[in-house]
């Protein structure tokens, strides 16, 4: 049974460091300022960011990572005439 | 005839806003991407925004906050709000399909 | 963010002339997304080229591109009277969607 119960603690520690390594990417993805400044949004000179950020961080990051992806879609519609790319969601809204 | 007509342009004093249109006729607009770009007088082409099939709507970073796209599927026209105008966005407004059909411009001039 | 630099900014050219302009990026255009526009004074632009070197439909075969990366250029086989316009380079960049050359004047020498 500890066999097991060491188990668990060492699957839920690998998961623990998991979320801060990703956290720790997703830091320096801002930090840098990957996903550059198409769309305005905050500024990407800020200081090192602290758990209160945590939310906006990975708010931010997927915001700016959405953003790219639309624009590379775009790109590829209108200055590559790839048309399969092009967004058909018609009904949303 | 399929084509793009821009309206709405006109002389604005600074500070002031405007609502360009972009209605399309012989073609529905729903399914493709709208970009809008401009051109002041003698000068050349800048792009300033998309807006896909969804309704999102993406801007280069000098047009953001003060310029919004958006669209009406259902009149099949294409917007472009634009406030807090200054002297240096006087320009012909070109609306776009893709970027391979586009209209013919309207003109904004700021200026008190 | 992508600058796009195109030269000359003006070219003086005699009809059945081979014409050459030259589209230079800051930085590599993403995904070799670069198109040439075609636009005469008081018109809006017309689309020539996409992807660097496809023609657009309808675009007489005598344009043509070529190009990757930052260097790209446009060429006109044989200038005709109808070629006399200001031509645009715009590529691709994934942080500012769309970059405009400059633009290049051919005129009649």
């Known amino acids: 049974r500890r066999d097991v119960a060491h188990g668990i603690l060492n699957e839920a520690y690998r998961k623990v460091l998991d979320q801060l390594s990703a956290g720790k990417h997703l830091q320096s993805l801002v930090a840098r300022g990957v996903g550059g400044s198409l769309g305005g949004g905050a500024g990407d000179d800020a200081e090192p960011l602290s758990k209160r950020h945590s939310d906006g961080i990975f708010t931010d990051s997927y915001s700016r990572y959405r953003k790219q992806m639309a624009v590379k879609k775009y790109l590829a519609a209108v200055l590559g005439k790839r048309y399969k790319q092009r967004v058909k969601n018609k009904g949303r809204r | 005839e399929v084509q793009l007509v821009e309206s709405g342009g006109g002389l604005v004093q600074p500070g002031g806003s405007l609502r360009l249109s972009c209605a399309a006729s012989?073609?529905?607009?729903?399914?493709?991407?709208m970009t809008w770009v401009r051109q002041a007088p003698g000068k050349g082409l800048e792009w300033i925004g998309f807006?896909?099939?969804?309704?999102?709507?993406y801007y280069a970073s000098w047009a953001k906050g003060r310029f919004t796209i958006s669209r009406d599927n259902s009149k099949n026209t294409v917007y472009l709000q634009m406030n807090s105008l200054r002297a240096e966005d006087t320009a012909v407004y070109f609306c776009?399909?893709?970027?391979?059909?586009w209209g013919q411009g309207t003109l904004v001039t700021v200026s008190s | 963010d992508i600058v796009l630099t195109q030269s000359p900014s003006t070219l003086s050219a005699s009809v059945g002339d081979r014409v050459t302009i030259t589209c230079q990026s800051s930085e590599s255009v993403y995904g070799n997304y670069l198109a040439w526009f075609q636009q005469k004074p008081g018109k809006a632009p017309k689309f020539l080229i996409y992807e660097a070197s496809k023609l657009e439909s309808g675009v007489p075969s005598r344009f043509s591109g070529s190009g990757s990366g930052t260097e790209f250029t446009l060429t006109i086989s044989s200038l005709q009277p109808d070629d006399f316009a200001t031509y645009y380079c715009?590529?691709?960049?994934?942080?500012?969607?769309?970059?405009f050359g400059g633009g290049t004047k051919v005129e009649i020498k």
């Open positions: 715009a590529g691709g960049d994934i942080s500012e969607g769309v970059a």
């Open positions: 776009a399909r893709d970027l391979d059909l």
């Open positions: 807006i896909d099939a969804g309704g999102d709507a």
């Open positions: 012989g073609i529905d607009l729903n399914s493709y991407y």
